[in-house]
């Protein structure tokens, strides 16, 4: 779970070691602050849980791609 040490900076100290079904994921944000020990992705699930994940892992990249495509507005 992400940890806000000194708001508004949120950091991840541990990553989930299991894949989360992409269908459970609602959105994500990248953590790139130099105040944090490591770069991370925080996924928010459809039931509003927040999960820290390793952006180097393929499933994390696939999930971000999937969410990006899902949020793209169709061309008119």
């Amino acid at each position: 779970q992400p940890d806000a040490i000194n708001a508004p900076v949120t950091c991840c100290y541990n990553f989930t070691n299991r894949k989360i079904s992409v269908q459970r994921l609602a959105s994500y944000r990248r953590i790139t602050s130099s105040k944090c020990p490591k770069e991370a992705v925080i996924f928010k699930t459809i039931v509003a849980k927040e999960i820290c994940a390793d952006p180097k892992q393929k499933w994390v990249q696939d999930s971000m791609d999937h969410l990006d495509k899902q949020t793209q507005t169709p061309k008119t």
């Epitope: 079904s21 459809i46 999960i51």
Partner: antibody, heavy 119, light 113 residues
């Protein structure tokens, strides 16, 4: 294609414990989320618990809290469900079921393990 | 917990006739951002594990005959067998996978009249 194979039928005395196993092939446990569902004779399907990657832990249905333990051995891609303090009402077929990364629903099921509790 | 309620409990239909099963959830299982209903339908024949028929409330699994269809959204769902065949005799269950604990309807037994 994921395949799920369960251990064989068991007969137990009331008060005893039973441990049922479920082995996955065609994938690994780290790719899946394994759950247990039971069905008493002539009754419906009842979710007992399973690994919830959103919480990073195994979660249990309230009805079974304290009496059921679900564990996994990632080296053999096998999950276990142990139910203690057995009573006659626990006589049922126990299924393991799993979803993969792209689905989120139970798309693979084991063949079922009949557990009979009788003195 | 989300409670799933099916009706009827049992249903006898003539061969070739339509069978309709409804499933109601006590809370919505629709996630509005992706417009997906987190609901599946299973078919269970005697002595067998459940077989997934439909996911996302209306998407037929590969290999499932097109006489099976799912519809509905939010809290009200329907499974329809447009022309009942002898091999469709089974118990049918809905299940939500929106939020844990995952919950099933009580089942609907479909028989031949």
């Amino acid at each position: 294609q994921v395949q799920v194979v369960q251990s064989g039928a068991e007969v137990k005395n009331p008060g005893a414990s039973v441990k049922v196993s479920c082995k996955v092939s065609g994938s690994t446990l780290t790719e899946l989320s394994m759950h247990w569902v039971r069905q008493a004779p002539g009754k419906g399907l009842e979710w007992m618990g399973g690994f919830d990657p959103e919480d990073g832990e195994t979660i249990y249905a309230q009805k079974f809290q304290g009496r059921v333990t679900m564990t996994e051995d990632t080296s053999t891609d096998t999950v276990y469900m142990e139910l203690s303090s057995l009573r006659s009402e626990d006589t049922a077929v126990y299924y393991c079921a799993t979803n993969d990364f792209w689905s989120g629903y139970f798309d693979y099921w084991g063949q079922g393990t009949l557990v009979t509790v009788s003195s | 917990d989300i409670v799933m309620t099916q009706s009827p409990d049992s249903l006898a239909v003539s061969l070739g006739e339509r069978a309709t099963i409804t499933c109601k959830s006590s809370q919505t299982v629709l996630y509005s951002s992706n417009n997906k209903n987190y609901l599946v339908w299973y078919q269970q024949k005697s002595g067998q594990p459940p077989k997934l028929l439909i996911h996302w409330a209306s998407i037929r699994e590969s290999g499932v005959p097109d006489r099976f269809s799912g519809s509905g959204s939010g809290t009200d769902f329907t499974l329809t067998i447009s022309s009942l065949q002898a091999e469709d005799v089974a118990v049918y269950y809905c299940q939500q996978y929106y939020s844990s604990p995952w919950t099933f309807g009580q089942g609907t037994k479909v028989e031949i009249k």
